[in-house]
C-alpha cells in the first residue's frame, strides 16, 4: 500500500477564455512533511504555477475544501484564462529538506481554452 | 469501534530505557499515520513522535530526537517506542494517537505512564 | 517553532450560557484555504477528544453546540449552550509545521 498518494481527478478541463479554471488535487496525507507545488509542464523547462510561500501569483487562489475528512484539498483556482494558459498541469509533493525533494507527482490535469 | 491500547510503561531510573506498545483494533492501522503525545502536569500536551503509514518516515521534537525511536508492524496492527537514556523531564502519561490524514490526532488511547525517578 | 498561546487558563460560566475560548498562534497556521488548528476535550482520568478539526469542521458526533472558528493566527472555541457535561479541560492543537504544537489549556468549569 502506497504511503502517500497525489490524485488529480479530472484528466482534462475546458475553459472559455476570459473565465476561472479549478484545478483538484488532493493528497491522501500530510506525511512525509513538506509542501505541496503546482506545474504547467514537465521537466527543467517546467513551470512554477503556484506555491504556498514563495512567489506571487496574483490570478492563483487556493480553493481547497477543508471539510473534507479523509484526505488534504490542495485544489487551485486561476482566473482570467486565456489561451497562453494552456497545458497540462501537475500537482506534486515534495519532502522538506534542504533542498526539498520531490516525492511523488498527480498524473496531470489538460487545461484546453475556448474562444470566448 | 476503534481501540489503541498502550502499554509498556513503568518505573525506570535515569539514563534506562522502556519500549511501549501500542496495539490498534477497530480500523485499517496500515492506512494511518501514528504518533505519540505525552502529558504532563506541569507542560500539558506535548507531540512526542510520529510514523508515516508505510513505516518510513518518522518525525521528532528535538527534546526526543536521538533518544526516543519510533516503530511499527502493520501485519501486528502495532506501534512501538523505544525509549533510551530516560531523563527525568521524560516523566509522563504517553498516549498512543492515529491521524488519518497526518494532520489532527483522530483518537487516542487511554495512556501508559512512564516514571523516570532514582 | 509555532507558540500558541489559549486563553483563558480557566473559565467558570453559568449553565446555558456561552462558553469561549481563544488560541492565537505565533504565525499563520494556514495553509492552501486550511487552516490547521484543531481542538480537543479532555474529562478528568481520559484521553483528549477531537471535537474540531482544521478550525471549524465538526467531528462526527460532537454535539453541534460546539462551533470553532479563525484563521491564520487567531481562533475561537464556542461552546452555546454550555452542559453540565461540558466540564473538562479544552486543548488547541496546530499541525500546520514542526514541531506539533499544543496551547497550554483552559479548564471550563460551571459558575
Known amino acids: 500500500e502506497e504511503e502517500l498518494q497525489v490524485i488529480q481527478p479530472e484528466k482534462s478541463v475546458s475553459v472559455a477564455a476570459g473565465e476561472s479554471a479549478t484545478l483538484n488535487c488532493t493528497a491522501t496525507s500530510l506525511i512525509p512533511v513538506g509542501p505541496i507545488q503546482w506545474f504547467r509542464g514537465v521537466g527543467p523547462g517546467r513551470e512554477l504555477i503556484y506555491h504556498q510561500k514563495e512567489g506571487h501569483f496574483p490570478r492563483v487562489t487556493p480553493v481547497s475544501d477543508p471539510t473534507k475528512r479523509n484526505n488534504m484539498d490542495f485544489s487551485i483556482r486561476i482566473s482570467n484564462i486565456t489561451p497562453a494558459d494552456a497545458g497540462t498541469y501537475y500537482c506534486v509533493k515534495f519532502r522538506k529538506g534542504s533542498p526539498d525533494v520531490e516525492l511523488k507527482s498527480g498524473a496531470g490535469t489538460e487545461l484546453s481554452v475556448r474562444a470566448k | 469501534e476503534v481501540q489503541l491500547v498502550e502499554s509498556g510503561g513503568g518505573l525506570v531510573k535515569p539514563g534506562g530505557s522502556l519500549r511501549l506498545s501500542c496495539a490498534a483494533s477497530?480500523?485499517?492501522?496500515?492506512?494511518?499515520?501514528m504518533s505519540w503525545v505525552r502529558q504532563t502536569p506541569g507542560k500539558g500536551l506535548e507531540w512526542v513522535a510520529t510514523?508515516?503509514?508505510?513505516?518510513?518516515?518518522?518525525y521528532y521534537p528535538d527534546s526526543v530526537k536521538g533518544r526516543f525511536t519510533l516503530s511499527r508492524d502493520n501485519a501486528k496492527n502495532s506501534l512501538y517506542l523505544q525509549m533510551n537514556s530516560l531523563r527525568a523531564e521524560d516523566t509522563a502519561v504517553y498516549y498512543c494517537?492515529?491521524?488519518?490524514?497526518?494532520?489532527?490526532?483522530?483518537?487516542w488511547g487511554q495512556g501508559t505512564t512512564v516514571t523516570v525517578s532514582s | 517553532d509555532i507558540v500558541i498561546t489559549q486563553s483563558p487558563a480557566s473559565l467558570a460560566v453559568s449553565l446555558g450560557e456561552r462558553a469561549t475560548i481563544s488560541c492565537r498562534a505565533s504565525?499563520?497556521?494556514?495553509?492552501?484555504?486550511?487552516?490547521?488548528m484543531h481542538w480537543y476535550q479532555q474529562k478528568p482520568g481520559q484521553p483528549p477528544k477531537l471535537l474540531i478539526y482544521?478550525?471549524?469542521n465538526l467531528e462526527s458526533g460532537v454535539p453541534d453546540r460546539f462551533s470553532g472558528s479563525g484563521s491564520r493566527t487567531d481562533f475561537t472555541l464556542t461552546i452555546n449552550p454550555l452542559q453540565a457535561e461540558d466540564v473538562a479541560t479544552y486543548y488547541c492543537?496546530?499541525?500546520?509545521?514542526?514541531?506539533?504544537?499544543f496551547g497550554g489549556g483552559t479548564k471550563v468549569e460551571i459558575k
Open positions: 494517537a492515529s491521524q488519518l490524514t497526518g494532520s489532527e490526532f483522530d483518537y
Open positions: 477497530g480500523f485499517t492501522f496500515s492506512s494511518y499515520v
Open positions: 510514523i508515516s503509514s508505510g513505516g518510513t518516515y518518522t
Open positions: 504565525e499563520s497556521v494556514d495553509s492552501y484555504g486550511n487552516s490547521f
Open positions: 482544521r478550525a471549524s
Open positions: 492543537h496546530q499541525s500546520a509545521d514542526l514541531p506539533w504544537t
